[in-house]
Interface confidence: medium
């Protein structure tokens, strides 16, 4: 499998403490929208799922930073294509999910890797920890 760490800003959403509580409406609905969005973006067979969605405050707390890990079958996609396909979807994300996306950053994730190799992110990602958000677990609500 190939893993990619992806980070982006949602500039039209306000960060608040509900995004630090995974049992709230705000957290669950945003996670659902993002999961569905990625299933739309990477429809090709190589996409396996995403995990470790994390929400953080953007600059000044006026936006939401989303961080997550994407998994693909080995050799089906590279960093450049992951970023390109995501950037190409930004307009549709705005109209379909009302998410204004900016500051996209994608990087390779060596797998497995230790906490030290992620430079303080503390998001240790291991095979047995993957919590897939797959298509059949989500019902479109738009």
């Amino acid at each position: 499998m190939s893993f990619f760490f992806l980070s982006f800003h949602i500039s039209n959403l306000q960060f608040n403490s509900s995004l630090e509580d995974p049992s709230t409406d705000y957290y669950q609905e945003l996670q659902r929208d993002i999961s569905e969005m990625f299933l739309q973006i990477y429809k090709q067979g190589g996409f396996l799922g995403l995990s470790n969605i994390k929400f953080r405050p953007g600059g000044g707390g006026g936006s939401v930073v989303v961080q997550l890990t994407l998994a693909f079958r080995e050799g089906t996609i590279n960093v450049h294509d992951v970023e390109t396909q995501f950037n190409q979807y930004k307009t549709e994300a705005a109209s379909r999910y009302n998410l204004t996306i900016s500051d996209v950053s994608v990087s390779d994730v060596p797998f497995p890797f230790s906490a030290q190799s992620v430079d303080g992110l503390n998001d240790i990602f291991e095979a047995q920890k993957i919590e897939w958000h797959e298509l059949e677990h989500h019902h479109h609500h738009h």
């Epitope: 509580d21 669950q28 969605i53 920890k129 919590e131």
Partner: antibody
Framework: EVQLLESGGGLVQPGGSLRLSCAAS????????MSWVRQAPGKGLEWVSG????????YYADSVKGRFTISRDNSKNTLYLQMNSLRAEDTAVYYC?????????WGQGTLVTVSS | QAVVTQEPSLTVSPGGTVTLTCGSS?????????ANWVQEKPGQAFRGLIG???KRAPGTPARFSGSLLGGKAALTLSGAQPEDEAEYYC?????????FGGGTKLTVL
């Protein structure tokens, strides 16, 4: 002052039902997710169920799924736990807890005893 | 359902430092597990100390801090006080449920 007051516990036979209530005061109840947590006699804590601030999302431990139902009435500042098909292993003190940064405030608990 | 493990008991000297840990049967604990730490003292209501891995609940003394350490969640108590003698429980979030650990009995001696 934040206060959570549980009620509705008691002695019930196996297979019976109980409805627990948790009356909240001292904070804006409708903006907080809430949970029920229990502690069996001489044991540690076990999370039972949780609910999002509007009640749109509910969560259950595997041990109670299909038997317990969590709900809330934000107009009454009250959290509920409907417990059906009770078993001896459900015997415990049941606590309601608020969740913003950790389970920060807890009630004093209500004792549920399931015995014939 | 995942199993969350804690040290059954630990002892610290007054003024000393101690670290309680919280491990997961599914692998390394991450920030996505939103580790929580709860304190239980006899005759008192439970009290949340730390949520979201490292955020202190209102009223939590600064001597308590939360972090991730070696693939586990950790609660560090720096400058232990006699009143810190208690049972400490951690809880981890797994997608749609919380799981508590068995608790650590901390003795200040």
């Amino acid at each position: 002052e934040v206060q959570l007051l549980e009620s509705g516990g008691g002695l019930v036979q196996p297979g019976g039902s109980l409805r627990l209530s948790c009356a909240a005061s001292g904070f804006t109840f409708r903006v907080y997710a809430m949970s029920w947590v229990r502690q069996a006699p001489g044991k540690g804590l076990e999370w039972v169920s949780g609910i999002s601030e509007t009640g749109s999302y509910t969560y259950y431990a595997d041990s109670v799924k299909g038997r317990f139902t969590i709900s809330r009435d934000n107009s009454k500042n009250t959290l509920y736990l409907q417990m059906n098909s009770l078993r001896a292993e459900d015997t415990a003190v049941y606590y309601c807890a608020r969740y913003p940064y950790g389970f920060d405030y807890w009630g004093q608990g209500t004792l549920v005893t399931v015995s014939s | 359902q995942a199993v969350v493990t804690q040290e059954p008991s630990l002892t610290v000297s007054p003024g000393g430092t101690v670290t309680l840990t919280c491990g997961s049967s599914t692998g390394a604990v991450t920030t996505s597990n939103y580790a929580n730490w709860v304190q239980e003292k006899p005759g008192q209501a439970f009290r949340g100390l730390i949520g979201g891995t490292n955020k202190r609940a209102p009223g939590t003394p600064a001597r308590f801090s939360g972090s991730l350490l070696g693939g586990k969640a950790a609660l560090t108590l720096s400058g232990a006080q006699p009143e810190d003698e208690a049972e400490y429980y951690c809880a981890l979030w797994y997608s749609n449920l919380w799981v508590f650990g068995g608790g650590t009995k901390l003795t200040v001696l």
